[in-house]
Interface confidence: low
């Protein structure tokens, strides 16, 4: 069927439509075109003949249509009139006519939208506003958007005039915004440029800041007042009702007690008329002396003087607090506090009391700290300690030995070889040493204040030779899934690898296994009785290696469920019973029976002679490792048949 | 100053023996491993066998176990080779060195010919 | 036994130029125990570098040794005259203790 599709049916005036034809038919003579719903020659717009391919104008043309050989119809720069319905008359060559309507509508392109407002300067819960969309344009839409939001339901927000005008009933701050009206037809769309809402508040009741209200004598009192409000609102500070100044803040140096008072600020808006006031009540405090500590015993001697601190001035009616390390007082029985806690004795000093101290005066306001006192506390010397550790030394390198004794005042050092006195310092050094060198190196430390003195001794051996190394162990019978065992390969020298082998084999890769302190140290964690090996480690450096005897390792373990045998739970009457009980444990187990609950007797094996029925019942052996503390059992049942009826056995 | 001195190389007929000597000095054997290695013409050096302190560990590269005995004598400050079914293959300038994992000392070499 | 492989097999450089030697084991070498020593020419070899990075006592510090596990490296800084010689690794993580063929460092 012929039909005629407009392309687009929605068009811009001055843009350009095209009627296209559908289906048209074969063997034509021609066609004409003609506006509105039926064939009429006075409002024939062209006609065409296709033998001649001649196209006639006819009274309704324009000059803006062009006519295709597909019959097709296109219209240029389209115009408001152009709106309608348009005919196609089509001429067979049988003269047969057909006929197809087709139809598009024209629509202006609009132009930008304005807004304009009833009220510039609208009062918060107040004055309304009417936004209304310009100009106003027939079969156009009209959308309105708040901050590029489409708008949200609000029973203060009213549309009218066909959506035209948008009316805020009662303003609020939160009106604020930007808002945007949209044109909208079938052809084009059009967005205003954002109108901004400036909605006159407040004040709201002023906030005065800081708000703290109690301050000391001597203090600069420095307030400041804000109250929301547009526009800006205008200050003004009263103190007891009396007029001060028009400023946001109010600042007074160094203020007395007569300072106190009600402090009043008014936030004014000259756009409302409006005015709020907040007031803070000031109360300035007389500033109390600063503490300090005096000490009955500047020089105590460790664990053997008490010390009596005492917090000055006295002042009646105060509280007194105190401070160690920065802390509040930690409990013990070495500190006693007086009754009014103006005293603080610390009985029996130690090196770890010596502070700070510090006490304070409690006021109204705050707490008033005391400088930080410390103690002086004379101790030690504690055993001196010779660093490096090394024991072993190759010729021809310096040895450089440091020593090292807690004490206070510090020590005084002096270094003996093999008993004789060498020098008084804390270093002792010797360049290129020989073998002559090895010997026993004492270190002395004096405390001149105590008296005291400690010393220790230490053994040089300088070889060119690695020395045949040791294992040491910090346990030698660990129990198994409990215990950890450190080995440690002696001596510990200088410029040294150690190695370790178990069972001659390189260590395996295990979480368990741990090499520690520049592998000197073999850490096993969690030893099991597989670990019940040969340990040897070994030395090297660029002269010389060497290994240690092996070492082997003593778990632990058990005692393990135990096993009874023979496995024979039925046995004929008069047989000889002969149990045996036996647990994996080191060291071995004690093994007890039960029969039937009742103790028996503590050996490994069970014997009963020519058994009956009577011995019918439950066996239980019970085993038990001394060393690990563990113990274990379990249980049997022993069937006794009467002669002849053995179970499994018939005639 | 550590000092390895050799003696003992020559021309030996296949299937013959020979023993090697390495002789110490400013150092105490008795404190140290000892090993042999050898270097065939153009060839890379080879491990071929090393004894502990006193004697009582001895291990040797399995091309010459059964044919080769390490020894010592801590008193002389002495090292030994005993080499016997001796191959063209053993052919190779012999080393005393110093050492159970790395080599520090080295004798000078001694040249071993196995030759018909 | 644990295969070394040095490379590359020979190395000419100037003296003052800088020299990288490669050692390459079959299968990881415990606790970085590779050696390297220095052979010239008639003479017995010298112990060099011990624990991979350890310098012997008396080694120049222009000889440094690096790596872990399979991969080990000589480096030879600025060459000097008596530098040019053959390079031997060894390892000695389990036994046999075994060597690499040997780089030799000769003058371009």
């Known amino acids: 069927k012929l039909t005629i599709e407009s392309t687009p049916f929605n068009v811009a005036e001055g843009k350009e439509v095209l009627l296209l034809v559908h289906n048209l038919p074969q063997h034509l003579f021609g066609y004409s075109w003609y506006k509105g719903e039926r064939v009429d020659g006075n409002r024939q717009i062209i006609g065409y003949v296709i033998g001649t391919q001649q196209a006639t104008p006819g009274p309704a043309y324009s000059g803006r249509e062009i006519i295709y050989p597909n019959a097709s119809l296109l219209i240029q720069n389209i115009i408001q009139n152009d709106t309608g319905f348009y005919t196609l008359h089509v001429i067979k060559s049988d003269l047969v006519n057909e006929e197809a309507t087709g139809q598009f509508r024209v629509y202006p392109e609009l132009p930008k939208p304005s807004i304009s407002s009833n009220n510039s300067k609208p009062v918060e819960d107040k004055d309304a506003v009417a936004f209304t969309c310009e100009p106003e344009t027939q079969d156009a839409t009209y959308l309105w958007w708040v901050n590029n939001q489409s708008l949200p339901v609000s029973p203060r927000l009213q549309l009218s005039n066909g959506n035209r005008t948008l009316t805020l009933f009662n303003v609020t701050r939160n009106d604020t915004a930007s808002y945007k009206c949209e044109t909208q037809n079938p052809v084009s769309a059009r967005r205003s440029d954002s109108v901004i809402l400036n909605v006159l508040y407040g004040p709201d009741a002023p906030t005065i800041s800081p708000l703290n209200t109690s301050y000391r004598s001597g203090e600069n009192l420095n307030l400041s007042c804000h109250a929301a409000s547009n526009p800006p609102a205008q200050y003004s500070w009263f103190v007891n009702g009396t007029f001060q100044q028009s400023t946001q803040e109010l600042f007074i140096p160094n203020i007395t007690v007569n300072n106190s008072g009600s402090y009043t600020c008014q936030a004014h808006n000259s756009d409302t008329g409006l005015n709020r006031t907040t007031v803070t009540t000031i109360t300035v405090y007389a500033e109390p002396p600063k503490p300090f500590i005096t000490s009955n015993n500047s020089n105590p001697v460790e664990d053997e003087d008490a010390v009596a601190l005492t917090c000055e001035p006295e002042i009646q009616n105060t509280t007194y607090l105190w401070w160690v390390n920065n802390q509040s007082l930690p409990v013990s029985p070495r500190l006693q506090l007086s009754n009014d806690n103006r005293t603080l004795t610390l009985l029996s000093v130690t090196r770890n009391d010596v502070g700070p101290y510090e006490c304070g005066i409690q006021n109204e306001l705050s707490v008033d700290h005391s400088d930080p006192v410390i103690l002086n506390v004379l101790y030690g010397p504690d055993d001196p300690t010779i660093s490096p550790s090394y024991t072993y030394y190759r010729p021809g390198v310096n040895l450089s030995l440091s020593c090292h004794a807690a004490s206070n005042p510090p020590a005084q050092y002096s270094w003996l070889i093999d008993g004789n006195i060498q020098q008084h310092t804390q270093e002792l050094f010797i360049s290129n040493i020989t073998e002559k060198n090895s010997g026993l190196y004492t270190c002395q430390a004096n405390n001149s204040a105590s008296g005291h003195s400690r010393t220790t001794v230490k053994t040089i051996t300088v070889s060119a030779e690695l020395p045949k190394p040791s294992i040491s162990s910090n346990n030698s019978k660990p129990v198994e899934d409990k215990d950890a065992v450190a080995f440690t390969c002696e001596p510990e020298a200088q410029n040294t690898t150690y190695l370790w082998w178990v069972n001659g084999q390189s260590l395996p890769v295990s979480p368990r296994l741990q090499l520690s302190n520049g592998n000197r140290t073999l850490t096993l964690f969690n030893v099991t009785r597989n670990d019940a090996r040969a340990y040897v480690c070994g030395i090297q450096n660029s002269v010389s290696a060497n290994r240690s005897d092996p070492v082997t390792l003593d778990v632990l373990y058990g005692p393990d469920t135990p096993i009874i045998s023979p496995p024979d739970s039925s046995y004929l009457s008069g047989a000889n019973l002969n149990l045996s009980c036996h647990s994996a444990s080191n060291p071995s187990p004690q093994y007890s029976w039960r029969i039937n609950g009742i103790p028996q007797q503590h050996t490994q094996v069970l014997f009963i002679a020519k058994i009956t029925p009577n011995n019918n019942g439950t066996y239980a052996c019970f085993v038990s490792n001394l060393a690990t503390g563990r113990n274990n059992s379990i249980v049997k049942s022993i069937t006794v048949s009467a002669s002849g009826t053995s179970p499994g056995l018939s005639a | 100053d550590v000092q390895l001195v050799q003696s003992g190389g020559g021309l030996v007929q296949p299937g013959g023996s020979l023993r090697l000597s390495c002789a110490g000095s400013g150092f105490t054997s008795s404190l140290s491993w000892m090993s042999w290695l050898r270097q065939a013409p153009g060839k890379g050096l080879e491990w071929v066998a090393n004894?502990?302190?006193?004697?009582?560990?001895?291990n040797y590269v399995d091309s010459v176990k059964g044919r080769f005995t390490i020894s010592r004598d801590n008193a002389q400050n002495s090292l030994y080779l005993q080499m016997s079914s001796l191959r063209a293959e053993d052919t190779a300038v012999y080393y005393c060195?110093?050492?159970?994992?790395?080599?520090?000392?080295w004798g000078q070499g001694t040249l071993l010919t196995v030759s018909p | 036994e644990i295969v070394l492989t040095q490379s590359p097999g020979t190395l000419s450089l100037s003296p003052g130029e800088r020299a990288t030697l490669s050692c390459r084991a079959s299968?990881?070498?415990?606790?970085?125990?590779l050696a390297w020593y220095q052979q010239r020419p008639g003479q017995a070899p010298r112990l060099l570098i011990y624990a991979a990075s350890s310098r012997a006592t008396g080694v120049p510090d222009r000889f440094s040794g690096s790596g872990s596990g399979t991969d080990f490296t000589l480096t030879i800084s600025r060459l000097e005259a008596e530098d040019f010689a053959m390079y031997h690794c060894?390892?000695?993580?389990?036994?046999?203790?075994?060597f690499g063929q040997g780089t030799m460092v000769d003058i371009k």
């Open positions: 299968q990881n070498i415990n606790n970085r125990f």
């Open positions: 060195a110093r050492g159970l994992w790395t080599f520090d000392s």
């Open positions: 004894i502990n302190q006193d004697g009582s560990e001895k």
């Open positions: 060894q390892q000695y993580g389990s036994f046999p203790r075994t």
